[in-house]
């Protein structure tokens, strides 16, 4: 009895022979048709079986069939060589229906009790297949109650037949100059029902070469050309193929920069497929010949489109394109077989003519005018009046294009004026004010600008003076008329200098005493040093030993003389240093305010008076001879004194220069 189409109830039940458990009658025929829902099968087993045994179960039997197939014909009680009894076997329908037929013939030799069987519907596991049978699904099979479904591995898609997995093998584009491509899963069998498209797309100018490698196995047919699976190669010029079978196709020189490879498979077959190694070629560029003193990298047998080379120069040579230096050079081969840039030169590094050395000269050691790599030059300073600072003056043209000293310095040496040279030597005893002779005080500077004052040359572009002497011109430095190299105040023969800037000590307060009475004038040009214009030295740390009480210093200037007029000729006076306490006491009496003499001052002069600096000498140097170096240095700056110059019991007061060395050095180095 077939069950209803909606399968509202579970399908199970019992079948038995007529009259069971009693004996069955003769000439009986009974048929049952069992139907399970789609995706289910029927399971049947016997709990009792007792039928007449006959050869091949010809007399009485139970026949089980599913569709057109007979599953079993059963009789007897136990199986024999030619007959089968069910015993403990379980029988399964092949599909969702099972037919059971019971038949007894016209007689029984003895009574038989027949059979009892039970059946039930159960899910078919479609994913289980017998050995040797084709799998239900290509890749993954998923069973569920009443059915199954297939799925595919990554890179595949389920075909519309719902069982086969087709490869997702289209749209791959190869843009490298060489590479490999193969059928999906190579060297394992390629997938069925797939259509693969591969593209090789190189820049215009390249030509693709295809080589089939390793093995080739694509389903073929003895009579028809590749009717099942095939490989085709298409360029913009021609089509190659179709290819199939087991023979490796020959090399294909496509003469094209774009190639499309199509591979199509059908639903059957088990073949390993193919593998292609592709390369490319192009019109070669001329072989690059390295310029002299250079080399090419990388070195290749040939250079084709997109290949490049660089030029590297030997040490001491630089890349030049025309006359312009290059940081690096790389040329690229173009599709027309030409290089994109002309070959550069490796030119010997030329440091160029060396810079002139102020107050010095340069000599070519390697050869006249030779300024190329490894050339040597020698700087020297003008003898007597200049000395070389920093290095020995020997410079070599190095690979970086710089003249470089043996210490590795790229800057010029410095010709520093020799300081403290004088034509005069001290006699050791005190003379009266005397006329200076040429070269006696070559550091002496005459400052005109409202009033007459003095200063002392430092280096070749600075003047040391008193703050009070230039205070009025601090904001108008150009108003200062600075003269040097002359003895006569009114002489038209002098070296003119102009001021660029005036630096007054920040601790100086005008019209409120003379503490910190010191100033520097920066000249707008360096002066040429000679026997009449020479800077004074600044005191060394050890200078105090030459400036003790009673040591002799020399003051010079064009200030007021005993006659009350400015001197026409430069005058000088040798005067001893006065004990500081003695000087302080001398200026503590009215009209001088208390504390007039500070630790930043030193005093010089005779207790008896008569020898002193005076108005017009302000800013000039009080100099001392350093007996160790045999050079004169500035110990004091003419600053102030008694209203009456050279008065007995009063002394000339000078700014103590040694206290201001850091201040002087800072300004000179900063400006």
């Amino acid at each position: 009895t077939p069950l209803g189409p909606k399968w509202p109830e579970p399908v199970f039940g019992r079948l038995a022979s007529p009259g069971f458990p009693g004996e069955y009658a003769n000439d009986q025929e009974r048929r049952w048709t069992l139907t399970a829902p789609p995706g289910y099968r029927l399971r049947l087993y016997f709990t009792h079986f007792d039928l007449e045994l006959s050869h091949l179960c010809e007399y009485d039997f139970v026949k089980l069939s599913s569709g057109a197939k007979v599953l079993a014909t059963l009789c007897g009680q136990e199986s024999t060589d030619t007959e089968r009894a069910p015993g403990k076997d379980t029988f399964y329908s092949l599909g969702s229906s099972l037919d059971i037929t019971f038949r007894s013939d016209y007689s029984n030799e003895k009574p038989f009790t027949g059979f009892e069987a039970f059946y039930a519907a159960e899910d078919i596991d479609e994913c289980q297949v017998a050995p040797g049978e084709a799998p239900t699904c290509d890749h993954h099979c998923h069973n569920h109650l009443g059915g199954f479904y297939c799925s595919c591995r990554a890179g595949y898609v389920l075909h519309r037949n719902k069982r086969t997995c087709s490869a997702l093998c289209s749209g791959q584009v190869f843009t490298q100059r060489s590479g490999e491509l193969s059928s999906p899963e190579y060297p394992r069998p390629y997938p069925k029902l797939s259509s693969c498209t591969y593209s090789i797309s190189l820049e215009e100018g390249f030509s693709v070469i295809l080589d089939f490698v390793e093995s080739f196995d694509v389903e073929t047919h003895p009579e028809t050309l590749c009717p099942y699976d095939f490989l085709k190669i298409q360029t913009d010029r021609e089509e190659h193929g179709p290819f199939c079978g087991k023979t490796l196709p020959h090399r294909i020189e496509t003469k094209s920069n774009t190639v499309t490879i199509t591979f199509v498979t059908d639903e059957s077959g088990d073949h390993t497929g193919w593998k292609i190694h592709y390369t490319s070629t192009a019109q070669p560029c001329p072989y690059p010949m390295a310029p002299p003193n250079g080399h090419v990298s990388p070195v290749q047998a040939k250079y084709i489109l997109k290949d490049s080379f660089s030029i590297f120069c030997e040490t001491g040579y630089e890349l030049l394109q025309g006359h312009l230096p290059l940081k690096s050079f790389t040329a690229v081969c173009q599709k027309d077989g030409s290089w994109d840039r002309p070959m550069p030169a490796c030119s010997i590094v030329d440091c160029g003519p060396p810079d002139d050395l102020p107050s010095g000269r340069v000599e070519y050691i390697t050869g006249p005018g030779v300024t190329t790599y490894k050339a040597v030059i020698q700087y020297s300073c003008e003898e007597t009046f200049y000395t070389m600072k920093v290095n020995d003056g020997k410079y070599v043209c190095e690979a970086d294009g710089f003249w470089t000293s043996s210490k590795g310095e790229k800057s010029l040496p410095v010709c520093e004026p020799v300081c403290g040279l004088s034509a005069r030597t001290t006699g050791g005893r005190i003379y009266g004010g005397q006329k200076a002779k040429p070269g006696d005080f070559p550091w002496q500077v005459l400052i005109l600008g409202g009033t007459t004052a003095a200063g002392a040359l430092l280096y070749d572009n600075w003047v040391l003076t008193a703050a009070h002497a230039v205070y009025e011109q601090k904001h108008d430095a150009s108003a200062l008329d600075i003269r040097m190299g002359t003895l006569k105040r009114l002489s038209p023969h002098y070296t003119q200098a102009w001021s660029e800037a005036v630096f007054i000590h920040e601790g100086y307060t005008h019209d409120a005493g003379f503490d910190n009475d010191i100033a520097l004038i920066k000249l707008n040009n360096k002066v040429v040093i000679n026997s009449n214009i020479t800077p004074i030295c600044l005191p060394r740390k050890e200078a105090e030993s030459f400036m003790r009480t009673d040591d002799i210093g020399t003051a010079s200037g064009w200030g007021l003389t005993q006659r009350g007029f400015l001197a026409r000729n430069l005058m000088y006076v040798d005067i001893p240093i006065v004990d500081h306490q003695k000087c302080t006491a001398a200026y503590e009496k009215p009209p001088y305010p208390r504390g007039s003499v500070t630790a930043n001052m030193l005093c010089a002069g005779l207790e008896s008076g008569g020898k002193d600096s005076c108005r017009g000498d302000s800013g000039g140097a009080l100099v001392f001879l350093d007996s160790e170096t045999e050079r004169w240095f500035v110990g004091g700056i003419v600053s102030w004194g008694s209203m009456n110059c050279g008065e007995a019991g009063q002394y000339g007061v000078y700014t103590k220069v040694i206290n201001y060395i850091p201040w002087i050095e800072n300004i000179i180095s900063d400006f």
């Epitope: 030049l320 394109q321 025309g322 006359h323 312009l324 290059l326 940081k327 030119s347 160029g352 294009g401």
Partner: antibody
Framework: QVTLKESGPVLVKPTETLTLTCTVS??????????VSWIRQPPGKALEWLAH???????SYRTSLKSRLTISKDTSKNQVVLTMTNMDPVDTATYYC??????????WGQGTLVTVSS | QPVLTQPPSVSVSPGQTASITCSGD??????AYWYQQKPGHSPVLVIY???KRPSGIPGRFSGSNSGNTATLTISGTQAMDEADYYC?????????FGTGTKVTVLA
């Protein structure tokens, strides 16, 4: 002492041709890896390279002005000449000549202001 | 013609460090040059071939160049460094100048 000095008209009418001369001293126009460049600077604007010529007579021009520019040198007079045709008010600028050495423009003239106006 | 881009202005306090950048495609593959121009004056070369200093240029000026950017650095900036600064490079055999940067030294 390297010096360069520009000379030429201070006023040019539109459509006219400008001729500028650069007189150099302190270096040779025929030897060494040196060149002379012309550069201009419109008022309040950036520097703009125009052309150069090297001792080897190798020349180069600003791409956008190539058709209007010509550079030449007279080694015997130590002069470099730049001509610029079809002048326009937008060409009003200070024109500098300068020396090129090792790729750097290391010495410049003081510049000459050229005004283009009718 | 390629473009070299500079910031229009840079402000710096005296004694501090000023950095001026110059950007251009693959500028690091080329040599960079830097010029200082004070009002009413001709430009002055302060750095050539990325990092070399012509004689007479103070040591506080330095340069570097890599990638797409060249940099001029003024360390311990002084009032006298207030000026316009231009970078320059060679493209093939044509010179290209930057847009210029005004450096202001704050009082």
């Amino acid at each position: 002492q390297v010096t360069l000095k520009e000379s030429g008209p201070v006023l040019v009418k539109p459509t006219e041709t400008l001729t500028l001369t650069c007189t150099v001293s302190g270096f040779s126009l025929s030897r060494g890896k040196m060149g002379v460049s012309w550069i201009r600077q419109p008022p309040g604007k950036a520097l703009e390279w125009l052309a150069h010529i090297f001792s080897s007579d190798e020349k180069s021009y600003r791409t956008s002005l190539k058709s209007r520019l010509t550079i030449s040198k007279d080694t015997s007079k130590n002069q470099v000449v730049l001509t610029m045709t079809n002048m326009d008010p937008v060409d009003t600028a200070t024109y500098y000549c300068a020396r090129i050495r090792r790729g750097g423009i290391d010495y410049w003239g003081q510049g000459t202001l050229v005004t283009v106006s009718s | 013609q390629p473009v070299l881009t500079q910031p229009p202005s840079v402000s710096v306090s005296p004694g501090q460090t000023a950095s001026i950048t110059c950007s251009g495609d693959k500028l690091g593959d080329k040599f960079a040059y830097w010029y200082q121009q004070k009002p009413g004056h001709s430009p002055v070369l302060v750095i050539y071939q990325d990092n070399k200093r012509p004689s007479g240029i103070p040591g506080r000026f330095s340069g570097s160049n890599s990638g797409n950017t060249a940099t001029l650095t003024i360390s311990g900036t002084q009032a006298m460094d207030e000026a316009d600064y231009y970078c320059q490079a060679w493209d093939s055999s044509t010179a290209v100048f930057g847009t210029g940067t005004k450096v202001t030294v704050l009082a």
